[in-house]
Amino acid sequence: FPMFKRGRCLCIGPGVKAVKVADIEKASIMYPSNNCDKIEVIITLKENKGQRCLNPKSKQARLIIKKVERKNF
C-alpha cells in the first residue's frame, strides 16, 4: 500500500499565487501526513469570506511558512 494518499488533501487545486495581506485573518500550514503527501497553506479570509489554498511554491506561501516556522521553533 502506498504510504501517502493524495485523496484527502484539503486543497483540490494548485492554490492561488497570492492573497491580499489585508484580507488575511489567519494562515495555517498542513504538513505532509498519511492523508496528504504535500504541504498545504490554508488562508482564512476576513469578513467570513471563506478559506483559500495558497500555492505552497509561491513567494507569499514561502514567506508565511518561514514566519510560522520561526514562531514555532
Partner: nanobody, 126 residues
C-alpha cells in the same frame, strides 16, 4: 484573465437531458477547479458540481447526485455538465466558474471562485 462562456441550455421536458458546456478563452483551464452553479428566480446561487484540476476528482450537491455528471476536456479547454432526469425544480440559469485556491470543504461555495461566465438558461417544463 480567463473568460468563461456557457452553452447548451434550453427548454426540455421533465425527464429529459442536456449537455452544458463551459469553454474558456484568454487562458487555459488546466490549473483551475471548475464549478457549476445555478440560480433560480428569487433564489440564492447554489453550487451543483465541481471538478478538481489536480486529480480530476468530482463533487456534487446532494440534489443532483446520480443525475448530473461533470467532466473536463483540457485539450478543448472545456468543461461539461451532463444533466439527466431533469425535474421542474432544476429550472435555473446555470453558470460555470473557475477558481484556483479551492478547499475540499468549500468546493461548492461561490466564495471559492474568481471567474464567472454569463450563464445559460435551463427550463424544465412540459
Amino acid at each position: 484573465e480567463v473568460q468563461l462562456v456557457e452553452s447548451g441550455g434550453g427548454l426540455v421536458q421533465p425527464g429529459g437531458s442536456l449537455r452544458l458546456s463551459c469553454a474558456a478563452s484568454g487562458g487555459t483551464l488546466d490549473d483551475y477547479v471548475i464549478g457549476w452553479f445555478r440560480q433560480a428566480p428569487g433564489k440564492e446561487r447554489e453550487g451543483v458540481s465541481c471538478i478538481s484540476s489536480t486529480d480530476g476528482s468530482t463533487y456534487y450537491a446532494d440534489s443532483v447526485k446520480g443525475r448530473f455528471t461533470i467532466s473536463r476536456d483540457n485539450a478543448k479547454n472545456t468543461v461539461y455538465l451532463q444533466v439527466n432526469s431533469l425535474k421542474p425544480e432544476d429550472t435555473a440559469v446555470y453558470y460555470c466558474a473557475a477558481g484556483m485556491g479551492v478547499l475540499r470543504q468549500w468546493a461548492l461555495s461561490k466564495l471559492s471562485y474568481d471567474y464567472w461566465g454569463q450563464g445559460t438558461q435551463v427550463t424544465v417544463s412540459s
